[in-house]
């Protein structure tokens, strides 16, 4: 009779991360009688998978009954596979011996490969805000993914973007990897409402790329443009200027009337109206009783907007002439106001 | 295909440096360790130790304690064999040789191996 | 260290002969072996692993057998391109450790 051959049928296995692994194993015949051992490699630092004979093994589970007489097949199933468990395990036959049972054939070994979902993407932006025309960067990261082979893109507002830099940790053969990019992306005024999209690809992922987001909001500043007009009111002696806030994302915006450089009142944007492309609009105003002054005065609006150095506009009110309007505003404007009598 | 390429041979004083390369292309250098085995010259082979590619940790045989020492530049997929203070003993062929495992964690036998370098230690 | 002794230094042969090369280790490695073949100037070349597993693209004129301590590489049918060094190899334990080597010639 010809010798025991130990047949594993597959040189490679994979396997999703999660799931579980059967390694096929047949013995060509029952003789010499003698249990069989799983390893995980070979060399002095191979590590035993499964004993038929002896020991506690709660993630494998043998293919056929190995109680039987008969039986030829040494097929085991090991469960819940993480990418750990790569490497080429090897089926050996162990012949009855005493004291102790002697190693007599292994198989050719199968090599085990584990796929593993990415993680989702994580996007981060810059820590502190940028303005329209700056460059900022995002970085977006993904972990615990295999095999290597991976696909990263970005996008703002669905249009792809070209700027960016990708590496995959570690460089050689891991378990798993991670993923790591940086992406530059220009500021323009309209991006309160833009968002920054990180897509990756995988094998694991059977063309549903996972996604990674972030909110331009949450990165742009846009500045405000100031405009100061006076109109006449109903009493000839008192003037109305108006400070209009225009186009400033986000919301934190405090103001200060200034006349010949004393303040005369700060107050805070609360009630704000909302421009389509998510910036915002305020106005505020100033009812000065040019009757009490003597000389011209200058009014100055001064907006410092989320916590950046000051800007200002100011206007000059001449007292000797009868004013002029100057500019037209609607009420639904006036979502501020200040009155200020001057004697 | 999978290739060990070995830097070429070297003709040292005793009490010298010698760093020889094994430059390793066609497969995934950190996935599988590598060894170091002697030849002195009409004698027989002599494992030296490994490196693990992936970790960078290093085993040497107890014979080769001390004065020999293995090194990585993954990036240019490269194992590197350095020998200090030679002596005329050193004089002899040295193979890189590839393990047969992914990830394994212990050489075991070698299915690839560099062409060698001899490595000549004379005054 | 387990010694592996290869007691035959060199063994002359003829072409289409059938060839024995023993391998004796100084403690059991199981079948822990793998055979190499060098030729002169060369690099060695891996035949057998697992003491009876023939590595890929390696004629099937090669057949290893053994286990414990006893272990032979066998050529059945002789060939010219045969001539050569074959030395057992065992990775039991460390250090790893190679036989001396036995040297095929044509008598």
């Known amino acids: 009779e010809e010798e025991l051959q130990v047949i594993q049928p597959d040189k490679s296995v994979l396997v999703a991360a999660g799931e579980t692994a059967t390694l096929r194993c047949t013995a060509t015949s029952l003789i010499p009688v003698g249990p069989i051992q799983w390893f995980r490699g070979a060399g002095p630092g191979r590590e035993l998978i499964y004993n038929q004979k002896e020991g506690h093994f709660p993630r494998v589970t043998t293919v056929s009954d190995l109680t039987k007489r008969n039986n030829m097949d040494f097929s085991i199933r090991i469960g819940n596979i993480t990418p750990a468990d790569a490497g080429t395990y090897y089926c050996v036959k162990f012949r009855k011996g005493s004291p102790d049972d002697v190693e007599f054939k292994s198989g050719a070994g199968t090599e085990l490969s584990v796929r593993a979902k990415p993680s989702a993407p994580v996007v981060s932006g810059p820590a502190a805000r940028a303005t329209p025309q700056h460059t900022v960067s995002f970085t977006c990261e993904s972990h615990g993914f295999s095999p290597r082979d991976i696909t990263l893109k970005w996008f703002k507002n669905g249009n792809e973007l070209s700027d960016f830099q990708t590496n995959v940790d570690p460089v050689g053969e891991s378990v798993s990897y991670s993923i790591h990019s940086t992406a530059k992306v220009v500021l323009t005024r309209e991006d309160v409402h833009s968002q920054v999209i990180c897509e990756v690809a995988h094998v694991t992922l059977q063309g549903d790329p996972l996604r990674g987001t972030a909110n331009l909001s949450e990165t742009i500043r846009v500045p405000p443009t100031l405009e100061v007009t006076q109109q006449p009111v109903r009493a000839e002696n008192q003037v109305n200027v108006t400070c209009q806030v225009r186009k400033f994302y986000p919301q934190r915006l405090q103001l200060t009337w200034l006349e010949n450089g004393n303040v005369s009142r700060t107050e805070t944007a609360s009630t704000v109206t909302e421009n389509k492309d998510g910036t915002y609009n305020w106005m505020s105003w100033l009812l000065v009783n040019v009757s009490a002054h003597r000389d011209d005065v200058k009014l100055t609006c001064q907006v410092e907007h989320d916590g950046q150095p000051a800007v200002s506009k100011s206007h000059d009110l001449k007292v000797s002439a009868h004013p002029k309007e100057q500019g037209s505003n609607t009420a639904a404007e006036n979502t501020g106001s200040n009155e200020r009598n001057i004697y | 295909q999978i290739q060990l390429v070995q830097s070429g041979p070297e003709l040292k004083k005793p009490g010298e440096t010698v760093k020889i390369s094994c430059r390793a292309s066609?497969?995934?250098?950190?996935?599988?360790?590598m060894s170091w085995v002697k030849q002195a010259p009409g004698k027989g082979l002599r494992w030296m130790g490994w490196?693990?590619?992936?970790?960078?940790?290093?085993t040497c045989a107890d014979d080769f304690k001390g004065r020999f020492a293995f090194s990585l530049e993954t990036s240019a997929t490269t194992a590197y064999l350095q020998i200090h203070n030679l002596t005329n003993e050193d004089t002899a062929t040295y193979f890189c040789a590839r393990d047969p495992h992914s990830y394994g964690n212990s050489p075991a036998w070698f299915p690839y191996w560099g062409q060698g370098t001899l490595v000549t230690v004379s005054a | 260290d387990i010694v592996m002794t290869q007691s035959q230094k060199f063994m002359s042969t003829t072409i289409r002969d059938r060839v024995s090369i023993t391998c004796k280790a100084s403690q059991n490695v199981g079948i822990s072996v793998a055979w190499y073949q060098q030729k002169s100037g060369q690099s060695p070349k891996l035949l057998i692993y697992?003491?009876?597993n023939r590595y890929t693209g390696v004629p099937d004129r090669f057949t290893g057998s053994g286990s414990g301590t006893d272990f032979t590489l066998t050529i059945s049918n002789m060939q010219s391109e045969d001539l050569a060094d074959y030395f057992c190899?065992?990775?039991?334990?460390?250090?790893?450790?190679f036989g001396s080597g036995t040297k095929l010639a044509i008598k």
């Open positions: 490196i693990n590619t992936y970790s960078g940790v290093s």
């Open positions: 066609g497969y995934t250098f950190t996935t599988y360790g």
């Open positions: 697992s003491a009876s």
């Open positions: 190899q065992q990775y039991s334990s460390y250090p790893l450790t």
